[in-house]
Interface confidence: medium
């Protein structure tokens, strides 16, 4: 019995269906096929869980969190024992193993390993202004998303015809900050932060209103 080399890893957006491949070749009839799918969750590597089991011509549920979401992609028994996971969750990320036995066929590699990464688009970031908006002050525009896998990068732009930040601005796309020094009336306006990763983007807006000192009455 020989389990085929798997492609290594599968990436899927949260909520979508993941297909985890596993196929084998055997010299024996599929009368005593036994397939166990296990997962070593990324969030808890010390606690492997059973995903689904095929034994004695019957399918059995694994861990409670997979109930109703997991099945074999084809009619069993078969030499393709790939599974699907519906409505993928962040907690499904991990290393999946298919263990195949088909007596009396012995020997060879009977384990296939596939990594699953569940990707999450950035949630709408939260925009914040730090510092006084008085003329001549320094302000920091802050932007961060609570969710996003891979970790989002952040691009700030001033929503005018140029989409460019003021010349006195410095941007950190990893931290999601923009520092604007010595703000002037030209600094006023709408600023948009775009949080993006491999599978999505989302935005937030800031309305920077530079406050000019009121002329004093004599």
């Amino acid at each position: 019995l020989e389990v085929s080399e798997s492609p290594g890893s599968v990436q899927v957006a949260r909520g979508q269906t993941a297909v985890l491949p596993c196929a084998f070749s055997t010299s024996a009839a599929l009368l005593n096929l036994n397939v166990i799918w296990m997962v070593i969750p990324l969030s808890n590597a010390n606690q492997p869980e059973q995903v689904i089991l095929y034994q004695g011509g019957q399918m059995f549920d694994g861990a409670l969190r997979f109930h109703g979401r997991v099945g074999f992609t084809g009619t069993m028994p078969a030499t393709n024992v790939s599974i699907f996971i519906n409505n993928t969750q962040l907690s499904d990320t991990g290393t999946y193993q298919c263990l195949v036995n088909n007596l009396p066929d012995r020997g060879g590699r009977n384990i296939g390993v596939t990594g699953l990464t569940v990707l999450v688009p950035p949630s709408a970031p939260q925009c914040q202004i730090q510092g006084s908006q008085d003329l001549g002050s320094d302000v920091i525009l802050l932007c961060s998303s609570e969710e996003g896998i891979p970790r989002p990068t952040y691009l700030w732009e001033k929503l005018d015809n140029t989409l460019k930040l003021p010349p006195t601005a410095t941007q950190d796309q990893v931290q999601g900050t923009v520092t604007i020094r010595n703000i002037s009336a030209l600094s006023s306006g709408l600023y948009q932060c775009v949080a993006s990763n491999a599978i999505g983007t989302s935005t937030c807006l800031l309305d920077l209103q530079v406050i000019s000192p009121q002329p004093r009455s004599v």
Epitope: P121, A124, L190, S202, C204, D207, S212
Partner: antibody, heavy 126, light 107 residues
Framework: EVQLLESGGGLVQPGGSLRLSCAAS????????MSWVRQAPGKGLEWVSA????????YYADSVKGRFTISRDNSKNTLYLQMNSLRAEDTAVYYC???????????????????WGQGTLVTVSS | DIQMTQSPSSLSASVGDRVTITCRAS??????LNWYQQKPGKAPKLLIY???SLQSGVPSRFSGSGSGTDFTLTISSLQPEDFATYYC?????????FGQGTKVEIK
């Protein structure tokens, strides 16, 4: 009392022009960004254009870009919307609205239209 | 553009009823969501900002909830003056967009 009062609406032929005004009172006008929002008869609300407090930055919906111009005169506490090349689909009640910023406990900024004018009707018809 | 979809588009209810209106955004907008009430021939009025914060002067029977893409406006006990059209509106990205409105009518 905080108030916005639009004027300048009326009947105009397709291809014509109109200038709407919005007079603000009861607040420091120059400290607030402002928007125009319109509502076609029997329809929902549609954001049209916005302008920063200083007047230095302007924003438009795609449906009016290149035809409408938003501006303000902070010395007169007045917001304007110059509408050119008017079309039948521009027929609507036009409202001016103030942008208010609301801070949250976590420190981030949210905005809403907290004060609206009573609206002025623009009818584009031949 | 961020699309805002309200449901239902209209509903009939009686005074004292609990009414729920939902609003769904086409992408995550965090809590950048406002609710407005509009009566015939009048300008819209801000009810709820930041998804769940009650605007000053608005009765406490109005409440908002939700975050991300799904939001709800609830009127705990409908009063005669609450018969109106309600709009949600996002402030996460330009263009600023509104839902199509939900008309609350007397049963």
């Amino acid at each position: 009392e905080v108030q916005l009062l639009e004027s300048g609406g009326g009947l105009v032929q397709p291809g014509g022009s109109l200038r709407l005004s919005c007079a603000a009172s009861g607040f420091t006008f120059s400290s607030y960004a402002m928007s125009w929002v319109r509502q076609a008869p029997g329809k929902g609300l549609e954001w049209v254009s916005a302008i920063s407090g200083s007047g230095g930055s302007t924003y438009y919906a795609d449906s009016v870009k290149g035809r409408f111009t938003i501006s303000r005169d902070n010395s007169k506490n007045t917001l304007y919307l110059q509408m050119n090349s008017l079309r039948a689909e521009d027929t609507a009640v036009y409202y001016c609205a103030r942008h208010e910023v609301f801070g949250t406990s976590s420190g981030y900024h949210l905005y809403a239209f907290d004060i609206w004018g009573q609206g002025t009707l623009v009818t584009v018809s031949s | 553009d961020i699309q805002m979809t309200q449901s239902p588009s209209s509903l009939s209810a009686s005074v004292g009823d609990r009414v729920t209106i939902t609003c769904r955004a086409s992408q995550s907008i965090s809590s950048y969501l406002n609710w407005y009430q509009q009566k015939p021939g009048k300008a819209p009025k801000l009810l709820i900002y930041a998804a769940s914060s009650l605007q000053s002067g608005v009765p406490s029977r109005f409440s908002g909830s939700g975050s991300g893409t799904d939001f709800t406006l609830t009127i705990s006990s409908l009063q005669p003056e609450d018969f109106a059209t309600y709009y949600c509106q996002q402030w996460s990205g330009l263009p600023l967009t509104f839902g199509q409105g939900t008309k609350v009518e007397i049963k």
